[in-house]
Amino acid sequence: EDNRCASSNAASCARCLALGPECGWCVQEDFISGGSRSERCDIVSNLISKGCSVDSIEYPSVHVIIPTENEINTQVTPGEVSIQLRPGAEANFMLKVHPLKKYPVDLYYLVDVSASMHNNIEKLNSVGNDLSRKMAFFSRDFRLGFGSYVDKTVSPYISIHPERIHNQCSDYNLDCMPPHGYIHVLSLTENITEFEKAVHRQKISGNIDTPEGGFDAMLQAAVCESHIGWRKEAKRLLLVMTDQTSHLALDSKLAGIVVPNDGNCHLKNNVYVKSTTMEHPSLGQLSEKLIDNNINVIFAVQGKQFHWYKDLLPLLPGTIAGEIESKAANLNNLVVEAYQKLISEVKVQVENQVQGIYFNITAICPDGSRKPGMEGCRNVTSNDEVLFNVTVTMKKCDVTGGKNYAIIKPIGFNETAKIHIHRNCSCQCEDNRGPKGKCVDETFLDSKCFQCDENKCHFDEDQFSSESCKSHKDQPVCSGRGVCVCGKCSCHKIKLGKVYGKYCEKDDFSCPYHHGNLCAGHGECEAGRCQCFSGWEGDRCQCPSAAAQHCVNSKGQVCSGRGTCVCGRCECTDPRSIGRFCEHCPTCYTACKENWNCMQCLHPHNLSQAILDQCKTSCALMEQQHYVDQTSECFSSPSYLR
């Protein structure tokens, strides 16, 4: 078997350790194994057998330290983990998530009060009373709050016609309150009478365009913790009641609002004051703020737009969508069912990603099944414990500075696990305070360039031309991202990540991200492209490799040769093709050729009875719906008209 430690010609201790977790470096002064090169880098057992004393071997080990004292977490344990890693090595530990028996519950109703919602708002008058009794079986301490939203109060979202600016819903013959971005009406309270009074006082409002400013309001409700009255210990539910879609970031450019949403609280006297000066949040930003603030969202949607919100769920972890019946009759059932579902799901997410550190998390569910951590476990009860097997890997040792801890957060929980990462990238022999030893293997040094005095080396640069550091004579030296040393590029170390390659033309930070992680955390970035670890594929390593088999048709072709497989789904590159495998291509040449006799059946005017009879027998199996609207191309194309 190949011994990469000995065969890689590592010239220094640090380079040796970077080769792999099995490699060690002998610092012993008199360690000579004979031959032309001093093989200081090798597998530890080989170094010992070659005469290196054990205490002269640099071999940092991997440690996982879980402090047992001062544990304050009750649901997520351990709350802190310290890991010492070396290049190529991985560390393992178990994280336990134990849901509490009964949580306090904070439920904030965020209601779209545009005119089309007036029937649904009437139902809110009675929800508090009934819901508090139904929730009494899931929570010992239940609070309700209320806020309303419409949209940004500028054209073209509202009518600025003088007669309509204060009453947007004259079309409905209703007396409306003026439009507003978001108003926080009632802070969370256990006083149901207060809630019912607040809802009873609520008047309808209105706007012009179909989408509403729901995400603006959601973000404010999530981040304005003290205004809303969110409790640290409570399960936080944000019920968004609407019948329309929501504006997204960039929509507001139409009104000349170009300042990106800063994600902060901007309530003054309970009114969102940046509604007309700051953009709607992006989905990613909204997701981040909801997770940071432990908010579980319940979209209670009436009408056709339910599916719009349902499609957003994968992008907003800890979120549920339910369809409300007319006049919101089933609103409370929806809340109870959503809460049941939310508290019975346990999944985790890695936040504060540390560059160069990779997490692989597997949930071990109470029923014994294993699931990816982001998928987590379902049907978890308060007696259950979910275990997460966490593997932390450090591939390389070229990251400088940056964060030194990551956070594993179970979604919707108010506790996290903080993972401190300590990189063992340097050798003790390089440390001036440590005992001097051979940290550089002098047999590898180019005497023309390197001048070494003990362990300190300097370079004589005059002997080398900088031309050898250019990829092309017109290009800058080392692509403008490094310096030329002895005719070779030494790339700049920058905070964004690693710059590398013969001419510093490559880097590991300009790759696509997926769910906030570079290459989805399942690959490495090289020259702006994700190089996926085994078992993963896709432009951002977001797809399990097994997914590709779902794109293969019965003939063994990927997407029938008319598309590309993206995460197990065919994306048809030929705009004329449709179907799960892009298999239907009514207007493709072969389809017309193969079915020419039947094509005329789709245009049966002026056909003889004999041909019509043939249509019924020979062409009955032809899937007509795929051809009906697209046959004109066959008839009009000269190649078919012989």
Epitope: A136, R140, E190, T193
Partner: antibody
Framework: EVQLQQTGAELMKPGASVKISCKAT????????IEWIKQRPGHGLEWIGH????????NYNEKFKGKAVITADTSSNTSYMQLSSLTSEDSAVYYC????????WGQGTLVTVSS | DIEMTQSPSSLSASLGDRVTISCSAS??????LNWYQQKPDGTVKLLIY???SLHSGVPSRFSGSGSGTDYSLTISNLEPEDIATYYC?????????FGGGTKLEIK
Amino acid sequence: EVQLQQTGAELMKPGASVKISCKATGYTFSTYWIEWIKQRPGHGLEWIGHILPGSVITNYNEKFKGKAVITADTSSNTSYMQLSSLTSEDSAVYYCARWGWDSYWGQGTLVTVSS
Amino acid sequence: DIEMTQSPSSLSASLGDRVTISCSASQGISNYLNWYQQKPDGTVKLLIYYTSSLHSGVPSRFSGSGSGTDYSLTISNLEPEDIATYYCQQYSDLPYTFGGGTKLEIK
């Protein structure tokens, strides 16, 4: 320890009124709904109504409107149910109960209506 | 009002038996169903809430299931202390209503 202590048995004349009490101890009285339930001898359970002591919201079974009035006094952690215009049909055991996942029932108060 | 029909009204079983009591609602009650146990001395205890959640302190031999309009309580391994009358109660809509009860006796 949670306890709901109800008043002892009551013997009443037809046409009279009776006020049964249910004293709660061992928990925050104002935040739990208190239910009142009737059980006639040899019969099943019948829901009368309930109250949320902290907000004095009440709901009644239509059948008992005009017959029963449920109140609560948060200063003494006690819920009361007054039954008026008593008839023999009102002879029953009346239970108070704390509503919710940690439900707890009182021992019951026997009311006998007899001339 | 939602009518709750319990069956059987009484049943006799041997120790160690598996016993099932049924409860049917006159309309869908979305799992808002509780089961109560009333001992011969009149004391009443909640056994199961929201169709299948076991009240704390209740032995795991008790279980509940069902959906829509049909629900059931199962006692998997009958013990002497299970002699009682069992009631289902819906709390989907006001007024809350109880089933007629099932009196369980030991053979």
